[in-house]
Each structure stands twice: as C-alpha cells, then as structure tokens.
C-alpha cells in the first residue's frame, strides 16, 4: 500500500510520491528487498521517476514550487520538495539545479534577518503538513522543518549555494534562543531534531527535549495520534543523532506498538518520518532488534 502512482497538482503529486520514496529508502537501508523480490524495486523507482518528472511541471521560474504554476509559491511545499528530492538523489537522477535552486529561493526569499522562515502562501492540502497544521508555535515549527530540509540538502548544494551554511546557522540561532519557551511536544521534537543535526541540542535544550517525553517513550500532544507518531519519529532521529542509545529502545518500542504502516488521508508526514526514523534506527543502533514492519509492495497496475 506504500507504492502508489503519483498524480495531480504540485501538492497531490508530492503526497503520492512520498510513500514510494520512503518505502524504497527504508528497504534499501534495512536491506530487506529479498523479502519482496528485487524486481519490485525497479517498478518502484519508475514511479519515483514519474513523480519527479511530474513535479517539475509545478516548478516556477524562481525555482520554488506551488500547487499550480500560477499560484504563489509555498515555503513549506518547496522545503518538502527539497527534503524528498534530497532523499531520492540516491535512487534516481535528480538535477541538482532543481534541488539547489529551491534551496536558494528558500534562503534568499523566505528567510527573515532573525533566521525565521516565513510562509506567505500556505498549501491548499493542509492535511499533508502533519503536525505543523494549526500549530500555535508556527515560527519555530516551520523554521525547524525548513532547516531540516536545508541540512538534508547540504552535501548536494553547499557548492552551488554559498549562503547555505550561514542560513543554517541563523535558523539554528533562532531555534536555540526560543527553544526553552516551547509548549508543544511536537515543536520540541521537530526543533530538537533540527538542533541535534547541528550538534546544538545540548545542556538546557537537551534537558527540555528529554523531559518532554511522556513516560520516556513518546512526544505527545492532545489530539491526532498521527501527529504524535510524526513527532516521536523526529525525536527518535534526534536521539540517534545524539547517540543516546539508552533512551532509544522504549521510543522504538512505542513507535512499533502503534502498528502504523503509513498511507491514508493526512498521513504524508507521519509516513515519511516513521520510516525515515526506523530506517535510521536499524542502521545506527548497535544491537537493534528486528522490526517486523508491514511494508506491502503491490505495484499499481499500469
């Protein structure tokens, strides 16, 4: 159910492309293709190529992305394209000018002097943005989201985008300065991961991050469980970055117990994050237990 044919507008296409990219990434990282048959990988890659090609139709002259060519470009959508394409670079041929042009646009057009990334044209499909939806800590959450995307594109775009390291530092400064005032577990988790990637989740910030976990195993706010899965996935990635292998097992157990296999309405971010986090766990954790995750690989009929 994770391998789907991407289609529709610039937002729907990314909704459709997400599960296929993350499923292939997960199975690559955990070396599990034998279970499904290697020939299925090729079919999945064709779908990713299709999604990539279709997405280029929604690329604007500024290198940013929107649901439609004539619609104002979205900060969040452009950052998400950067994030997905950065992961897909190892799977299909992606034009670095497409990726790094989007990075440059985010930095030059959407980052304020204090490091914050602003959104002037929110996506139509609000269900695709996960825990950022109706988030009253929007500056922190969106800045963390964009910063994570920039860091994932760093190796690819550093040479083409001179302002990238400075932009990352500035966004990190903003997150660090405001982190201790956060109230939502979701924002603590996503900003925590952004800071951990920079080696800046330390001291009081680390204490805030660790003590925000409920029962030492999940980052949870009242409301949608999908957002808690997404938040806890960000937190797991942060813990892995910190090499805090004492804290990791109960978090992995909790994620596993949710029996969340992705797919369904509003699942874009939870799907992407849970598989990214669990793939990273199986790669990084010294003696990880095998995770029996149900990744179904039925290719869509042509």
């Amino acid at each position: 159910h994770l391998i789907v044919t991407p289609s529709g507008c610039g937002e729907q296409n990314m909704i459709g492309m997400t599960p296929t990219v993350i499923a292939v990434h997960y199975l690559d990282e955990t070396e599990q293709w034998e279970k499904f048959g290697l020939e299925k990988r090729q079919g999945a890659l064709e779908l990713i190529k299709k999604g990539y090609t279709q997405q280029l139709a929604f690329r604007q002259p500024s290198s940013a992305f929107a649901a439609f060519v004539k619609r104002a470009p979205s900060t969040w959508l452009t950052a998400y394209v950067v994030k997905v394409f950065s992961l897909a670079v190892n799977l299909i041929a992606i034009d670095s000018q497409v990726l790094c042009g989007a990075v440059k646009w985010l930095i030059l057009e959407k980052q304020k002097p204090d490091g914050v990334f602003q959104e002037d044209a929110p996506v139509i499909h609000q269900e695709m943005i996960g825990g950022l939806r109706n988030n009253n800590e929007k500056d922190m959450a969106l800045t963390a989201f964009v910063l994570i995307s920039l860091q994932e594109a760093k190796d690819i775009c550093e040479e083409q985008v001179n302002s990238l390291p400075g932009s990352i530092t500035k966004a990190g400064d903003f997150l660090e300065a405001n982190y201790m005032n956060l109230q939502r577990s979701y924002t603590v988790a996503i900003a925590g991961y952004a800071l951990a990637q920079m080696g800046r989740l330390k001291g009081p910030l680390l204490n805030k991050f660790l003590t925000t976990a409920k029962d030492k195993n999940r980052w949870e706010d009242p409301g949608k469980q999908l957002y808690n899965v997404e938040a806890t996935s960000y937190a797991l990635l942060a813990l892995l970055q910190l090499k805090d292998f004492d804290f990791v097992p109960p978090v992995v157990r909790w994620l596993n117990e949710q029996r969340y296999y992705g797919g369904g309405y509003g699942s874009t971010q939870a799907t992407f994050m849970v598989f990214q986090a669990l793939a990273q766990y199986q790669k990084d954790a010294p003696d990880h237990q095998e995770l029996n995750l149900d990744v179904s690989l039925q290719l869509p009929s042509r």
């Epitope: 201790m180 330390k202 003590t211 030492k216």
Partner: antibody
Framework: QVQLQQSGAELVRPGTSVKVSCKAS????????IEWVKQRPGQGLEWIGV????????NYNEKFKGKATLTADKSSSTAYMHLSSLTSEDSAVYFC?????????WGQGTLVTVSA | DIQMTQSTSSLSASLGDRVTISCRAS??????LNWYQQRPDGTVKLLIY???RLHSGVPSRFSGSGSGTDYSLTISNLEQEDIATYFC?????????FGGGTTLEIR
C-alpha cells in the same frame, strides 16, 4: 515576579528520608523546567537533576539516581525532591531553580542535616 | 564529567576596582558558560549566561568573555553589594558541573 519558595530546614536521622518542596509563583509553572542543586557546607554546587512539570519527565545526574526522586504537582505549582537512605554525606543545602538558558531564578535553599 | 576549575578561591579588592574572575573547563564547552553570584546570606542569582549575555536586572558593570575552555567574569567598578562568591557553570554537556567558587573580599 518569579519566586521559588522552599520548605524549611530539616533535621533527620540516618537511614530515613526527607521531602523538600519548592513552591513556584509569578509564572506558568508547567512551562519551565525545575532544576535541583546540592551545596555541602563550604563546598561548591552539584547538579542533582531536572523535572519538567508539564510532562513530569525527569533527567538525573547519574550520581543521584536512586538517591533523589523528583516530582511536581501542577495543581499547587510545587516541585518536590525526595531524598532516601540518608547519610551524613547528604547533609547540605538543597536549592531548586527555574531553568531557562541558565538557572535563572533560585529558591532560598533548604538546609537538610542528617544526624543521629 | 566536565571539570570546571576556578583556580582562585578568594580574591581581595577595593571598592571601585576592576576585578576579573577566571574559570577553566576540562574540555571545550562551546560557549555554554554561565556565572552565578551567591551572597553571604546564601541567596543565588544568575548573572550571565552563554558567556556574555546579561540576565535581566543584572547591572552592566558585570561582563563575561572567553571561548573554548577559558572564560572570565569581570566586574568593572566593584561595589559593596558585589561582595559574594562567584561560581561558573558549564551548560554544554550533562551532567551540568560548577566551578568551586571564587569569594570576593574587601581589601
């Protein structure tokens, strides 16, 4: 204004336990971490651990695991530190402090004396 | 654990003097250094966080500097109310650790 009011001095027997309280006022209690610090007579300061009153999440200095237990009661805006199996080494002044980027506001300290 | 060393345990100075108190970490603490003042009555106050940022209400005669492993607190114009013990604390790596303190006395 922000205030942390700690409970009064305690004289306790070795082997027993004690609970020190720290009542917060002047701010939203659930929104800030509360840290605990130990100061032995004429000595420096030692970090014991931290509690997040919003989630009851804790993090301890390894040295104080099993010795100190941190709790918080949101309804009364009070943080507590329970110290068990007391020995003369536990005789000290114990401080609570509100964490920001640094221990921004401190209680006045609670002297715990362990003596037979 | 990171060791914090304040090599001078006590310091004599006159009112109006410029006083510098130093603190050394056993490893790089990337600027996560705070300074506290403990008055003779036991009350503790945060003076400076992140090397040089003044906590609210702290007089501007206090300043902090340093990098890597070496840091210092300077009081530019010593006043009677500054007579206290000063502690440095690293906020870089858990567990937090403090220096042994430097006590200021009036000469």
């Amino acid at each position: 204004q922000v205030q942390l009011q700690q409970s009064g001095a305690e004289l306790v027997r070795p082997g027993t336990s004690v609970k020190v309280s720290c009542k917060a006022s002047g701010y939203a209690f659930a929104h800030y971490l509360i840290e605990w610090v130990k100061q032995r007579p004429g000595q420096g300061l030692e970090w014991i651990g931290v509690i997040n009153p919003g989630t009851d999440g804790t993090n301890y200095n390894e040295k104080f695991k099993g010795k100190a237990t941190l709790t918080a009661d949101k309804s009364s805006s009070t943080a507590y530190m329970h110290l068990s199996s007391l020995t003369s080494e536990d005789s000290a002044v114990y401080f609570c402090a509100r964490e920001e980027l640094g221990f921004a506001y401190w209680g006045q300290g609670t002297l715990v004396t362990v003596s037979a | 654990d990171i060791q914090m060393t304040q090599s001078t345990s006590s310091l004599s100075a006159s009112l109006g003097d410029r006083v510098t108190i130093s603190c050394r970490a056993s490893q790089d603490i990337s600027n996560h250094l705070n300074w506290y003042q403990q008055r003779p009555d036991g009350t503790v106050k945060l003076l400076i966080y992140y090397i040089s940022r003044l906590h609210s209400g702290v007089p501007s005669r206090f300043s902090g500097s340093g990098s890597g492993t070496d840091y210092s607190l300077t009081i530019s114009n010593l006043e009677q109310e500054d007579i206290a013990t000063y502690f440095c604390q690293q906020g870089d790596t858990l567990p937090y650790t403090f220096g042994g303190g430097t006590t200021l006395e009036i000469r």
